[in-house]
C-alpha cells in the first residue's frame, strides 16, 4: 500500500510522544503549584490539540489558542515578571534560584511547550511527526510560532509593577525588534499597570567592562518604552556567574561589590 501523500516542511517534525509529554508536564506542574491544582490536564490537552489538529499548519491564528489560554489563566504578582531575549538558559537559572520571579516558561502554558515542536495536517486528525513549518523557510503562522506569540502577548499584558528583562550583551543586536520580546512583549506591556521596565544586559566576556546600557539598540528600546509612558532603567551584569552566585548567597562578602 502506497503511503498517503504528506506535506513536506523545512522544519523538524512534532516532538516524539508529544501528547504524553504535554500531559505529563501538566500533571507535574499542577502537583507542584497549588494555585493550579484545579486544572484538569486532560482538558488542557484537549484544548491544546484542538488548536492545531486538522488545521492547515500555515494558517494557525491566535484565536485557535484561546480555549487553551483560558484554561491556563495564571497571574504573576506585581514586580515579579522576568522577560528575556536570546538568553533563555540564564533567565531560567535565575528564576530557579529566585523562586518568587517568573519567566513565561515558569507559567503552566510556557512550561508545557518549552522546547517542543508540534503541527498537524489540514483535514486529517494526524499529528505530523515527519516535518513542521519553519518560521523563515515556510511560514510564520505555524502552530509553534503562533503559540509563543499568543502566550507571550498574554504574559506581557498581565504584567504589573516593575518588569525586568534579561538581554544578551554578546549579540550584535542586544535589543532586537524582531525577537518575541521586541515584536510582541514590549508592545503589550500596559502603561496603566507597568511603572517601569528594567533591562539587565548580560555581559559575555569576562573582561568586558563597557557600559552596554549605552548600546544604540538599548537606546532604541528606551525610546520605545518611554513613548509608551513606561519608565526605563538599565543595568549591566558584568559577571553572570557571580550574579547567579549572589542571588543564591546574597550575604557573601564578594557580593557587596559590583556584579
Amino acid at each position: 500500500v502506497l503511503p498517503r501523500w504528506r506535506q513536506q516542511w523545512s522544519g523538524s517534525g512534532t516532538t516524539s510522544r508529544f501528547p504524553e509529554t504535554v500531559l505529563a508536564r501538566c500533571v507535574k506542574y499542577t502537583e507542584v503549584h497549588p494555585e493550579m491544582r484545579h486544572v484538569d490536564c486532560q482538558s488542557v490537552w484537549d484544548a491544546f490539540k484542538g488548536a492545531f489538529i486538522s488545521k492547515y499548519p500555515c494558517n494557525i491564528t491566535e484565536e485557535d489558542y484561546q480555549p487553551l489560554v483560558k484554561l491556563g489563566t495564571q497571574t504573576v504578582p506585581c514586580n515579579k515578571t522576568l522577560l528575556w531575549s536570546r538568553i533563555k538558559d540564564l533567565a531560567h537559572q535565575f528564576t530557579q534560584v529566585q523562586r518568587d520571579m517568573f519567566t513565561l516558561e515558569d507559567m503552566l502554558l510556557g512550561y508545557l511547550a518549552d522546547d517542543l515542536t508540534w503541527c498537524g495536517e489540514f483535514n486529517t486528525f494526524e499529528i505530523n511527526y515527519q516535518s513542521c513549518p519553519d518560521w523563515r523557510k515556510d511560514c510564520s503562522n505555524n502552530p509553534v510560532s503562533v503559540f509563543w506569540k499568543t502566550v507571550s502577548r498574554r504574559f506581557a499584558e498581565t504584567a504589573c509593577g516593575v518588569v525586568h528583562v534579561m538581554l544578551n550583551g554578546s549579540r550584535s543586536k542586544i535589543f532586537d525588534k524582531n525577537s518575541t520580546f521586541g515584536s510582541v512583549e514590549v508592545h503589550n506591556l500596559q502603561p496603566e499597570k507597568v511603572q517601569a521596565l528594567e533591562a539587565w544586559v548580560i555581559h559575555g566576556g569576562r573582561e568586558d567592562s563597557r557600559d552596554l546600557c549605552q548600546d544604540p539598540t538599548i537606546k532604541e528600546l528606551e525610546s520605545i518604552i518611554s513613548k509608551r509612558n513606561i519608565r526605563f532603567f538599565c543595568k549591566n551584569i558584568y559577571r553572570p556567574d557571580k550574579f547567579l552566585q549572589c542571588v543564591k548567597n546574597p550575604e557573601d562578602s564578594s557580593c557587596l561589590s559590583g556584579i
Epitope: 498517503r4 486528525f125 494526524e126
Partner: antibody, heavy 120, light 111 residues
Amino acid sequence: EVQLLESGGGLVQPGGSLRLSCAASGFLFDDYGMSWVRQAPGKGLEWVSAISYKGGSTYYADSVKGRFTISRDNSKNTLYLQMSSLRAEDTAVYYCAKDHKWNYYGMDVWGQGTTVTVSS
Amino acid sequence: QSVLTQPPSASGTPGQRVTISCSGSTSNIGNDNYVSWYQQLPGTAPRLLIYKDDQRPSGVPDRFSGSKSGTSASLAISGLQSEDEADYYCGTWDDRLNAWVFGGGTKLTVL
C-alpha cells in the same frame, strides 16, 4: 484492593430514563479518568463514554450523544451515567472502568457490570 | 462495523503460539495512540492484558505480548493453555471520532 461496583441497572421501557452509579475504592479516584463500556447480549465491547479525572472533559460515542450524560463526584468516589430516551438497542451489561491514566491509555480495572434491559 | 478490525476467530493447540491482529487507521493506531488488549473469559468482566502497545500489567503472564507497527497492532500468546480460551479485544483512542474504539473481538479456541 482496587474495586469498582456498578449499580442502578434494571428493566426500563423505551423512552425511559435510568441512572447508573459506580462506587470506586482502593485508589485515588480523583487522579484517574473513568469510562463506561457496554456489551449487548452475545456481542462485543462498545465504549460508551469517558470523563477526565477532574471532570473537565467528557466524551461520548455517537450512538449515545445527546441522550447519555457522564458525571463524577470526586468527594463521593462515584461515577455516574444518566441515560435518557432509552432504546431497545441500549440493552446491555454496562461496565464501569478506570482509565489506566489518560483516556487514550486504556482501562486497567473493570467492575462486574450492571444489566440494563430496555423493553416494553 | 468496528473501527478496528480483528479476525472473528483464532485457534491453536496447547503449547502453540497464536497471534491476533488488530488493524486500524491513521486517526487511531497510526496517530501515536497507544493500543491496549483485553481478555474476557466466559461470563466475566474484561481484564487488561496489554497497555501502551506492549506493556504488561502485574499479574499478566509473560506468555502474552503486544506489538505495534504503523496502523496495525498484534497480540501474541505463546505456550497456549486451555485457560486462555476467551474473547480478546484490542482498543485505542481515535482522534477523528474523539472517542475510544474497540475491535470487534476475536474468539480464541484452544483445541
